[in-house]
Amino acid sequence: DCCSCQEKWVGYRCNCYFISSEQKTWNESRHLCASQKSSLLQLQNTDELDFMSSSQQFYWIGLSYSEEHTAWLWENGSALSQYLFPSFETFNTKNCIAYNPNGNALDESCEDKNRYICKQQLI
Amino acid sequence: ARHCGHCPEEWITYSNSCYYIGKERRTWEESLLACTSKNSSLLSIDNEEEMKFLSIISPSSWIGVFRNSSHHPWVTMNGLAFKHEIKDSDNAELNCAVLQVNRLKSAQCGSSIIYHCKHKL
């Protein structure tokens, strides 16, 4: 039904999340999410993953730098809010962004391997 | 935040269960009571896969497994013998069980540790 997530996915506040335990490059992560009819995590705010805020892990999220727009963009083309990650202005624009659910972000080489989070909106 | 699904608001759903992911630290007994007051049980672990999932969500939490003393067996909340290995079981002071990064350990029941609650759908 419209309120259920696929097996092995977490349901929270009308969203479904797949939290990987495997480590992949950013591109591999993006393709794996797409293959499950979802996209790499796009955050609305830093308490979106409140339920796992004590996790120590970093996860690839769906943010990459667009040279064309000279801005960090989510996979759906919307721009990163400057309030989400105060340190984003110092990020290396060649890198991809890994996120820790306590609200911090790191820019790391897109070829590095991290866990990843896919997201699907229920409604 | 919108609310969907069959679990209480601010709980998560996973594999036909609802989980309350606590952030506050309590003793084992306080955790038991807190979960009861939420019409649920202190976290129980049914299989390896669930243990792996919960370890991703939270680095450590009480589970609903205890023993009366080091001479007694580990039991679940419904009195059944608990089959999985619990580390540090030879320490007589540690009679309540904790999930800690993909393994189960014994801990002092009076320690303040994060707790999670669960109820099956």
Partner: antibody, heavy 118, light 107 residues
Framework: EVQLQQSGAELVKPGASVKLSCTAS????????MHWVKQRPEQGLEWIGR????????QYDPKFQGKATIPADTSSNTAYLQLSSLTSEDTAVYYC???????????WGQGTLVTVSA | DIQMTQTTSSLSASLGDRVTISCRAS??????LNWYQQKPDGTVKLLIY???RLHSGVPSRFSGSGSGTDYSLTISNLEQEDIATYFC?????????FGGGTKLEIK
């Protein structure tokens, strides 16, 4: 394998300028940021600044603004550090660093000693 | 600028010891804390970034912890090759700044 090969030691007179080089191998400098770090004798490390070689954008610690300039030549995969109006305070080892993440320094060159003396 | 303080400038330990080196920031740096090792010949290596993430190729005897303003680097089983000076560095706010270093010597 990532390597940063820095130019040799320099002995320069007060008031003069110097240009140090850092040639990268094992990666393309256009794909990252290059930083320079200063270490005076028996002292700690100070971040001077960084360049994005792909577009030439630079950022400096304000205390090195006017003293240091960081250019890069992507065709030779080389970053430079130019220091002007040298004084004894500029006597130090200068390290070029490959950033990888923006805020930590993953790989360091061997360092270049600059001695300012009359 | 954020000031980074390593109160212990030198430290003596025996081989096999567990050694902890600490570092304090003048304000909360949200775990953006990195550790470097500088050998006597001047060679510098990144050990740990973002408080506890081990850089590739770094032995697992090195670990980092901390939060807010207080951070530490632990070497669990000191080896001869660990004799060096250790620097912390904050990556929270430009300009990036380093601690003064802690020189580790063998007893």
């Amino acid at each position: 394998e990532v390597q940063l090969q820095q130019s040799g030691a320099e002995l320069v007179k007060p008031g003069a300028s110097v240009k140090l080089s850092c040639t990268a191998s094992g990666f393309n400098i256009k794909d990252t940021y290059m930083h320079w770090v200063k270490q005076r004798p028996e002292q700690g490390l100070e971040w001077i600044g960084r360049i994005d070689p792909a577009n030439g954008n630079t950022q400096y610690d304000p205390k090195f603004q006017g003293k240091a300039t960081i250019p890069a030549d992507t065709s030779s995969n080389t970053a430079y550090l130019q220091l002007s109006s040298l004084t004894s305070e500029d006597t130090a080892v200068y390290y070029c660093v490959y950033g990888r993440g923006s805020a930590w320094f993953a790989f360091w060159g061997q360092g270049t000693l600059v001695t300012v003396s009359a | 600028d954020i000031q980074m303080t390593q109160t212990t400038s030198s430290l003596s330990a025996s081989l096999g010891d567990r050694v902890t080196i600490s570092c304090r920031a003048s304000q909360d740096i949200s775990n953006y804390l990195n550790w470097y090792q500088q050998k006597p010949d001047g060679t510098v290596k990144l050990l740990i970034y973002y408080t506890s993430r081990l850089h590739s190729g770094v032995p697992s005897r090195f670990s980092g912890s901390g939060s807010g303003t207080d951070y530490s680097l632990t070497i669990s089983n000191l080896e001869q090759e660990d004799i060096a000076t250790y620097f912390c560095q904050q990556g929270n706010t430009l300009p990036w700044t380093f601690g003064g270093g802690t020189k580790l010597e063998i007893k």
